[in-house]
């Protein structure tokens, strides 16, 4: 008789990821019978929620179904109807939720209130939606990265599965730009973590790591830009800036009530004798490093060594992993290529601030000129952030891998924080049994 | 401030295939959806499908899956639908359109001018 | 698929008068939305999610409703009211519009 394929016994899980500047729905499979092993989650679907994050819905609670459904429709239509009712839906905000939490407590949770009914009407498994932590969103981040690179994985192969192998066992570190916080995680080589904030002890099939993390809040790209924004308005002489992270030409204008908005330029405020004033461009990248450094206070540190404002950050040590924001810009500037130096980026940025605005628009004219507007700023801020503030150097920039994917699974934290809310990664190394079921009879 | 600018009328004969396109401006071409809806002269809304231009996903109406086909091209931030095996049941208007969430989470709904697809012989 | 109703569908009506259209979904739907449509224009977005006018809306309009059962209403018609209006659901696929109410002038 001729051999029937078996119902594909397979498990899924949808995890949200509510930034601060919009959400994405993530879709995860796996084969059921190898829950345990290393590796065999990965990502079916990735779907952009139409519009900003949810914290932008804080005076218009009631609309946040409607931003949902899109994509809650999609996941209704990848997944199996009948796997529905056991798929777990989990949805976790980020630093925009943090900000506005730190804002109004009520407001946040307003907020979280509508998302979890609007998500309980869906036919999934809603499991409940929350703000993490920035230690959450570091660690996940790097459980996700090490994960899909196969480096909780205690079988040696022979072939590599994934790029940046480095064919032994030595973990990536994790580093995670977001709009409105940035992430640093790694295991640092034989270093006592000085501060107990910001040490994470994991056992993971059978493995004991001691895992450094750190998540600085308003130090995402688009929190960064509003802070130097703040901070330079308060030295200019009237309501015009010139701003050396604009393109030459590029002009616009904005209002100190939007400046002053976010607690992120809290430390800057200060009566302006203008209610607007105007961006003017200058485009000029070493101007535009020099600014965004003033962001970083490096003038006190009560540890052996630190990364800025304090923050205590040991010696970096081995690869690491740039993803989300991080990679999403230097894939637009083209300088993702592992061959590209440090120098070399350096000099690619100088000349892409340099670049008049009319130029910018017409070599782009597909991008929203919000976003194509702020590249400049954005890459400058990504070179100043690892160089300055993270004490990466020309040398150790070729251990920095800008990535978007892992084996068709998007880098972020969404996985790993599925992962352990699913119970999926094993404190111990799981009993191999010597065949796995075969889907053929 | 979006706009769509749809292809000019069309005028084929049954069985004929027709491409008919709609370029947006204004925004972020993978940031919403694109629809399209047709419309009888004097009739209702009929809605085609969409395409998610982030994800090159498609959704198609079962009524026209597999005689309507909804592509995009990026790099010229344009949709296009093409339609075969056309019938005199096929006149219609075409219309594209978007909707979704603006970066002030403010609701917006844009459409296209509309395409007129006349089927006769 | 959900099915729209609208009644009525053609409604005959002086300025000034008071206008009630219903929509009816043949399962739940989670919101509405209304569209006026003029001869020869694309149609274009009125109410959304349920109650919320669109931009430039006149306040004279209004929208209801829940489940299965919405509805739009014009407090007092005045001329540039005469149109045909459609509701939409957008809360799974296929979306599908009414028939359409066309408010005509008596």
């Known amino acids: 008789t001729q051999n029937k394929a078996l119902p594909e016994n397979v498990k899924y899980g949808i995890v949200l990821d509510a930034g601060s500047s919009h959400t994405s729905l993530y879709i995860y499979k796996w084969p059921a019978e190898k829950e345990n092993d290393t590796g065999v989650v990965h990502q079916v679907e990735e779907c952009r929620v139409k519009g900003p994050g949810i914290s932008k819905f804080v005076q218009k609670v009631n609309e946040i179904g409607i931003y949902l459904t899109d994509c809650m429709e999609r996941a209704r239509e990848v997944i199996p109807r009948s796997q529905h009712q056991e798929t777990p839906v989990y949805l976790g905000a980020t630093a925009g939720m943090r900000l506005l939490r730190m804002e109004s407590e009520e407001l946040a949770d307003r907020v979280l209130d509508v998302v979890e009914r609007s998500l309980s009407n869906y036919p999934f498994d809603f499991q409940g939606a929350r703000i993490i932590t920035g230690q959450e969103e570091g660690a996940y981040g790097w459980i996700t990265i090490n994960y899909l690179l196969g480096k909780f994985s205690q079988k040696t192969r022979w072939f590599s599965i994934v790029p940046y192998e480095t064919n032994n066992q030595e973990t990536f570190g994790a580093l995670d730009l977001g709009g409105a916080s940035t992430q640093v995680t790694f295991v640092p080589q034989n270093q006592t973590i000085e501060s107990p904030d910001n040490a994470l002890q994991f056992r993971l099939y059978g493995k004991d790591y001691n895992v450094y993390t750190h998540s600085f809040l308003c130090y995402g790209k688009d929190q960064a830009l509003w802070q130097k924004l703040a901070k330079d308005i308060q030295v200019a002489s009237n309501e015009i800036l010139r701003d050396p992270c604009f393109h030459p030409g590029y002009k616009k204008v904005v209002n100190v009530s939007d400046l002053y908005k976010t607690p992120c330029t809290k430390r800057f405020e200060m009566t302006l004798p203008f209610q607007q004033f105007e961006i003017q461009g200058i485009g000029n990248y070493q101007q535009c490093h020099q600014s965004i450094l003033e962001l970083f206070n490096t003038s006190y540190c009560p540890y052996s060594q630190c990364a800025f404002n304090g923050i205590f950050l040991p010696p970096l040590q081995g690869d690491f992993g740039a993803f989300s924001a991080f990679y999403f810009v230097m894939k637009f500037l083209n300088l993702t290529s592992e061959k590209v130096s440090q120098e070399k980026v350096t000099e690619m940025m100088k000349k892409f601030c340099a670049q008049p605005w009319e130029e910018i628009k017409t070599s782009y004219a597909g991008v929203k000129e919000k976003y194509l507007s702020e590249y400049c700023f954005s890459g400058t801020y990504i070179l100043s952030l690892l160089l300055q503030g993270y004490h990466f150097t020309a040398d150790s920039w070729e251990h920095i891998h800008f990535i978007g994917k892992i084996q068709g699974s998007d880098a972020g934290w969404t996985l790993g924080y599925m992962l352990n809310l699913t119970n999926m990664i094993p404190a111990e190394q799981p009993l191999s049994t010597p065949l796995s079921h075969s889907t053929y009879v | 401030e979006v706009q769509l600018l749809q292809s000019g009328p069309e005028v084929v004969k049954p069985g004929a295939t027709v491409k008919i396109s709609c370029k947006v401006s204004g925004y972020s071409f993978t940031d919403y959806n694109l629809n399209w809806v047709r419309q009888y002269p004097g009739k209702n809304l009929e809605w085609v499908g969409n395409?998610?231009?982030?994800?090159?996903?498609?959704r198609y109406n079962q009524k026209f899956k597999g005689r309507f086909t909804i592509t995009i091209d990026q790099s010229k931030n344009t949709a296009y639908m093409e339609l075969r095996s056309l019938t005199s049941e096929d006149t219609a208007v075409y219309y594209c359109?978007?909707?979704?969430?603006?970066?002030?989470?403010?609701?917006?709904?844009?459409w296209g001018q509309g395409t007129m697809l006349t089927v006769s012989s | 698929e959900i099915v729209l109703t609208q009644s009525p569908a053609i409604l005959s009506l002086s300025p000034g008068e008071r206008v009630t259209i219903t929509c009816s979904a043949s399962?739940?739907?989670?919101?509405m939305h209304w569209f006026q449509q003029k001869p020869g224009q694309a149609p274009r977005l009125w109410i959304y999610?349920?109650?919320n006018l669109a931009s430039g809306i006149p306040a004279r309009f209004s929208g209801s409703g829940s489940g299965t059962e919405y509805t739009l209403t014009i407090s007092s018609m005045e001329s540039e009211d005469f149109a045909v209006y459609y509701c939409q659901q957008r809360s799974s696929y296929p979306l599908t519009f009414g028939q359409g109410t066309k408010l005509e002038i008596k």
């Open positions: 999610a349920t109650s």
């Open positions: 399962s739940s739907v989670s919101y």
């Open positions: 395409i998610d231009p982030y994800s090159g996903g498609t």
């Open positions: 359109g978007l909707y979704g969430y603006d970066d002030d989470a403010n609701y917006f709904d844009d």
